[in-house]
């Protein structure tokens, strides 16, 4: 289906005469009749097989024909056809004079014809106009023509029907050749198939409109490429729908049994080590100083008296700490800072090495005690002196200082004041009415010259580094008890400290 269009442009009839040569009165009021028919080698009268059309009076004698297509007029003239355009045609254009208003053929006199032209040829469908001019003795007609397809018809012969649509039956426009051109987002022979969201899984996804991705049962995700696990699957995944494959650390049909409670819940406190011991169970191994199922309770680690050699224990956040007495070190004050090479035993004590020389023990002579034999044994605790005598420690033994009138080792004997030479150390005895008086030689004092008054050996503070000084009464010498980290007779040498420990 298409339209043969004829555009009349100019008609010249300068003399205003009819085909017979007779002039028109008052002028030739000209209209046209057009006949379109199948191709004839010699155009002859007969049915206008492709159609006819007439115009109103377009002008008088000579005139140009206005293009009226935009105004809804009749130029170009339209000759529609409802068949495949054959590509060839015959065209007859007659110019007629209209003496009155009735333009019907039967109303016109036979000699009202002004001119008649006939052409034939081939004509392809197209938008371009073919310009032609036909001249006779008295008239000239200029015109152009073309064949175009009707709406929705396409192709070289206007034989291909194509009506654009955007509905359930298709989503397309028509190309010039009549082929379908799918609207964006549609595909298929009739553009009925939507193009799904890019990446939408071919098997697991589909769409009912473009850029959509609807998932088939068992699949999910923007692109329908994630399977849906079995309903109730807790800590699992799937590779095909409705499966449930447990993640690491989970068990049970629905992966809801915690096989790795330690990792998932961190139940152990205070740096304890957690061990999984089956479904939803665990064991905490506590660090020192903690107890309880989750090692949540803090122990006082000093309760077990861990510090040795007189060390004092202090509780700390991360355990305990032993404060060691002088001469000891180590976590539990178990190591001595001295060895026998340092001559640590005083008052004639003998040194014995222990633990391959790491520490030592002193074997003390009678009357001395202490880890370094630095303490004199007090032999006066039993009050052996009679008659109010005063007991005095003297080196390895003891002696009694008797009241006037008494003598003997334990003041057990009554004597005259000077009879028994009560003045010691060569002291001179003087009898007095109420007792006696001794005059003592140099270096001695006391009522009986019994007290040695040589200079106190510790008076000069001979011990360094805050060491404790003891006087060795048997030799009038001093003994230094060194604090932790020092050795030597005066504690003047720092020892190489033991390596530091992390506690």
């Amino acid at each position: 289906s298409g339209v043969f269009q004829l555009q009349l442009q100019e008609f010249i009839n300068e003399r205003g005469v009819l085909a017979s040569g007779r002039p028109c009165e008052p002028g030739c009021r000209t209209f046209f009749r057009v006949c379109l028919k199948h191709f004839q080698a010699v155009v002859s009268p007969g049915p206008c097989t492709f159609g006819t059309v007439s115009t109103p009076v377009l002008g008088t004698n000579s005139f140009a024909v206005r293009d009226d297509s935009s105004g809804g007029g009749r130029n170009p003239l339209q000759l529609p056809f409802n068949f495949t355009w054959p590509g060839t045609f015959s065209l007859i254009i007659e110019a007629w004079h209209a003496p009155g208003d009735d333009l019907r053929p039967e109303a016109l006199p036979p000699d009202a014809l002004i001119s008649k032209i006939a052409i034939q040829g081939s004509l392809a469908v197209g938008q371009n106009w073919l310009l032609d001019e036909q001249t006779s003795t008295l008239t000239r007609l200029r015109y152009s023509y073309r064949v175009i397809c009707s709406d929705n018809y396409y192709g070289d012969n206007c034989s291909r029907l194509c009506k654009k649509r955007n509905d359930h039956f298709g989503h397309y426009v028509c190309q010039p050749d009549g082929n379908l051109s799918c609207l964006p987002g549609w595909t298929g022979e009739y553009c009925q198939q939507p193009i799904c969201l890019s990446g939408c899984h071919e098997q697991n996804g589909y769409c009912s409109k473009p850029a959509e991705c609807l998932c088939r049962p068992g699949w999910q995700g923007r692109l329908c490429n994630e399977c849906i696990p079995h309903n109730g699957c807790r800590h699992g995944t799937c590779s095909t729908p409705w499966q449930c494959t447990c993640d690491e650390g989970w068990g049970g049909l629905f992966c809801d049994q915690d096989l790795n409670y330690c990792t998932h819940h961190s139940p152990c406190k205070n740096g304890a080590t957690c061990s999984n011991s089956g479904q939803r169970s665990y064991t905490c191994t506590c660090r020192p100083g903690y107890t309880g199922v989750d090692c949540e309770l803090e122990l006082s680690e000093c309760d077990s008296n861990p510090c040795r050699n007189g060390g004092s224990c202090k509780d700390q956040e991360d355990g305990y700490h032993c404060l060691c007495p002088p001469g000891y070190y180590g976590l539990h004050c178990e190591h001595s800072t001295l060895s026998c090479a340092d001559s640590p035993c005083f008052n004639g004590g003998s040194c014995r090495e222990r633990n391959q020389g790491a520490n030592y023990a002193c074997e003390c002579p009678p009357n001395f005690t202490g880890s370094n034999c630095e303490k004199k044994v007090d032999r006066c605790t039993s009050n052996p002196c009679a008659n109010g005598g005063q007991c005095l420690n003297r080196g390895p033994s003891r002696m009694c200082r008797c009241r006037p009138g008494f003598t003997g080792t334990y003041c057990e004997l009554h004597v005259s004041d000077c009879a028994r030479n009560p003045c010691a150390h060569g002291g001179t005895c003087h009898d007095l009415e109420n007792g006696l008086m001794c005059t003592c030689p140099a270096g001695f004092s006391g009522r009986r010259c019994e007290v040695r008054t040589s200079i106190d050996a510790c008076a000069s503070s001979p011990c360094f580094n805050r060491a404790t000084c003891y006087t060795d009464l048997s030799t009038d010498t001093f003994v230094c008890n060194c604090p932790y980290g020092f050795v030597g007779s005066r504690c003047e040498f720092p020892v190489g400290l033991p390596p530091s420990f992390p506690w």
Epitope: C233, G236, Q243, C244, C246, G251, L253, F254, C255, Q257
Partner: nanobody
Framework: EVQLVESGGGLVQPGGSLRLSCTAS????????IGWFRQAPGKEPEGISC????????YDADSVKGRFTISRDNAKNTVYLQMNSLKPEDTAVYYC?????????????WGQGTQVTVSS
């Protein structure tokens, strides 16, 4: 093709007993763990019990502990669920399932189910 067929379901009074059977085919029975789960109308499925390929019972749901016992007979390719002291809340469709591996860790195949109704 893996197939699991359950049987033994039915109507039982509260306090009564039932024994469900699950007969398997299409795979080497000894190699797979087998378990039971159930689903009551409008509720999520609940894992009941599972027995590993070696026969160790991997777990029992708290709701059935002491009442339900799972066992397997490899010679008959069958797993059993002995259900005692049944309660109305045990009413559900009971499914036999396997993770397709030796340990009770998931579900890959399951049967059509057997209905258990506990009602007086």
């Amino acid at each position: 093709e893996v197939q699991l067929v359950e049987s033994g379901g039915g109507l039982v009074q509260p306090g009564g007993s039932l024994r469900l059977s699950c007969t398997a085919s299409g795979f080497t029975f000894d190699d797979y763990a087998i378990g039971w789960f159930r689903q009551a109308p409008g509720k999520e499925p609940e894992g009941i019990s599972c027995i590993s390929s070696s026969g160790s019972i991997t777990y029992d749901a708290d709701s059935v502990k002491g009442r339900f016992t799972i066992s397997r007979d490899n010679a008959k390719n069958t797993v059993y669920l002995q259900m005692n002291s049944l309660k109305p809340e045990d009413t559900a469709v009971y499914y036999c399932a396997t993770p397709g591996i030796a340990a009770c860790r998931g579900i890959h195949y399951w049967g059509q189910g057997t209905q258990v109704t506990v009602s007086s």
